[in-house]
Amino acid sequence: TGADTEAVVCVGTACYTAHSGKLSAAEAQNHCNQNGGNLATVKSKEEAQHVQRVLAQLLRREAALTARMSKFWIGLQREKGKCLDPSLPLKGFSWVGGGEDTPYSNWHKELRNSCISKRCVSLLLDLSQPLLPSRLPKWSEGPCGSPGSPGSNIEGFVCKFSFKGMCRPLALGGPGQVTYTTPFQTTSSSLEAVPFASAANVACGEGDKDETQSHYFLCKEKAPDVFDWGSSGPLCVSPKYGCNFNNGGCHQDCFEGGDGSFLCGCRPGFRLLDDLVTCASRNPCSSSPCRGGATCVLGPHGKNYTCRCPQGYQLDSSQLDCVDVDECQDSPCAQECVNTPGGFRCECWVGYEPGGPGEGACQDVDECALGRSPCAQGCTNTDGSFHCSCEEGYVLAGEDGTQCQDVDECVGPGGPLCDSLCFNTQGSFHCGCLPGWVLAPNGVSCTMGPVSLGPPSGPPDEEDKGEKEGSTVPRAATASPTRGPEGTPKATPTTSRPSLSSDAPITSAPLKMLAPSGSPGVWREPSIHHATAASGPQEPAGGDSSVATQNNDGTDGQK
């Protein structure tokens, strides 16, 4: 069914209408929209009370509502694909007519967590309880109903219509009937405020057709923000009643003349307006002309007023209403500025944090600070970022350049640094010599020593060598030399100073080198490609490193 019974309450600059009828939220919104409104907002406790009043009026008239709980659509909806947001007062819902989110909410229970379906909000009325201002209708969210299938829809809806202003109800000084027709097509004979552009039809008399007089008025804007009917004096006055009927229709005082005529007057501090009925305060602020949180400030001699806004807001073009100031226009922040109602907040870019001199300043985050460094070794903080470095003998590694990897000085394009054998270690290297040769004091060259078939002179003890932290490479590592059939290195005669390489084996006894002092009885063999007997020192280079070990008896040992 369509929307049937209706009730209306007008207050401030808005009218609320309540309707019964099983419509979907979309149909209800369409109904409100056809008459120039929207499903009602409930943006404050005061507005909730206005809506409650119009619902109470509807329920007094509506006998058909037999359900104990009744629901009425309001204009709070969440579109398909928009998720419930528990961090917000409106939980991700928004008002159909637009406008900013407000802190007021009155949810009935925890909301269903969903994103896919469009969700709509209704006011939940417990009809078994009296409607009290202290017990405002709760908000209930759910599916939005289906057009054309009343079974899936709720009992009714509330519309809201906003206006430039309102006229006071017409005052009758004698018997008669006023019928107001609003721009949203509602007729009523009792409105506490009548919206701009409404028509008033006044039928004077006590019902006798002969004595009935009719008057027609329109609520007009007489001056900016001043609305009236353009009538003067009380309507339907009757000498028979004088001031005794409805105070002569006067707003405050009624003064009778001896001939049954009467005049309206005002109490001290008030003045009579042009309609000769209504009294207005001599203090122009008493009518609360300022809106949106603006404060009314009296001008000199109490003649006029100006509206003043709270900090973070400014007057709009009407000079009556406050609108948010976008403080971010003035670039008050060092980096990012986020405008908020009545203020703003500063935010910092990634790599920065709030701090430093001045409001809204950002200071560099020291990623290298104790306990938070992402680098394996050296960390240098930079403005908004950082970079990692490695100690001598290591190079940066890893996808993000935070790890350090050992440089193998014994291989590479420049060739090894050592004259003869080269042993890579963590972050460094050491030289050694072939049997019959000894390491010169410079630690690089080899000189002919006493003839010996013992092991080659090896590197010093491990504990004498510096090792870098944070490396992800195994310790002191070299590869095993090429082996002959009996497990000994292949040997072929060479002339001059031999060069150890996979294709140029040397003539000597099995190559053995002393293991570090911590591992007695274990020999280490240098990698064939890591050991050279070259004619002088050469440049170090990076490379791989792996280890083979050999026992005293010539058998393979375990690493």
Epitope: G81, C83, D85, R112, N113, S114, I116, S117, K118, P143
Partner: antibody, heavy 120, light 108 residues
Framework: QVQLVQSGAEMVKPGASVKISCKAS????????MHWVRQTPVYGLEWIGG????????AYNQNFKGRVTMTRDTSISTAYMELSRLTSDDTAVYYC?????????????WGQGTLVTVSS | EIVLTQSPSSLSASVGDRVTITCRAS???????LHWYQQKPGKAPKLLIY???NLAFGVPSRFSGSGSGTSYTFTISSLQPEDIATYYC?????????FGSGTKLEIK
């Protein structure tokens, strides 16, 4: 506790359709949306779409529009995902998933997965 | 649709290492709608971190997340052997939901 149990592996021919089920237990079926995600070696994890069991409303990834249909049977707390006009590219593990009491589409509960192989 | 690019695509680290994975979005994503998952071979993904930095129920505190806008980071403060898995970021800012391409984490 929340459990999502999916139907078994399927071997289907190109051009055919497949319908996978996901039976929910441990909560009120209509309280949580049910979503479907598939995983292939080439495309990784792909969201196919979701259904609101309370209303039957659906949301589909445009890449699957016209080929995917999601339904539910609230009486047996089961959601279904049907994919038609299959090609070898649809060979994947298909998961049903929902976000339980968490917000913002953080998928907290997952089915065990259903392997669908499209081969002639 | 919003494309999420994860880096690195794979990484090898040692037990006890600090591991960081980055997820970059092709356009801004609300931090509430950015989540991280762990997937082990043959298993369904498991939610680790929701809304950028909140640990899912039962997830160890060595996992953490941060970021905003288009840049998000997932960190394991001290890598454990059981953390070997592929890690995915996921976002929602209007349909479709999208996932990152994944970061495969291995132990050295």
């Amino acid at each position: 506790q929340v459990q999502l149990v999916q139907s078994g592996a399927e071997m289907v021919k190109p051009g055919a359709s497949v319908k996978i089920s996901c039976k929910a237990s441990g909560y009120t079926f209509t309280d949580y949306e049910m979503h479907w995600v598939r995983q292939t070696p080439v495309y990784g994890l792909e969201w196919i779409g979701g259904i609101d069991p309370e209303t039957g409303d659906t949301a589909y990834n445009q890449n699957f529009k016209g080929r995917v249909t999601m339904t539910r049977d609230t009486s047996i707390s089961t959601a279904y995902m049907e994919l038609s006009r299959l090609t070898s590219d649809d060979t994947a593990v298909y998961y049903c998933t929902n976000y339980g009491n968490l917000y913002y589409y953080a998928m907290d509960y997952w089915g065990q997965g259903t392997l669908v192989t499209v081969s002639s | 649709e919003i494309v999420l690019t994860q880096s690195p695509s794979s990484l090898s680290a040692s037990v006890g290492d600090r591991v960081t994975i980055t997820c970059r979005a092709s356009s801004s994503v609300s931090s509430s709608y950015l989540h991280w998952y762990q997937q082990k071979p043959g298993k369904a993904p498991k939610l680790l971190i929701y809304s950028t930095s909140n640990l899912a129920f039962g997830v160890p505190s060595r996992f953490s997340g941060s970021g905003s806008g288009t840049s998000y980071t997932f960190t394991i403060s001290s890598l454990q052997p059981e953390d070997i898995a592929t890690y995915y970021c996921q976002q929602y800012s209007g349909y479709p939901l999208t996932f990152g391409s994944g970061t495969k984490l291995e132990i050295k």
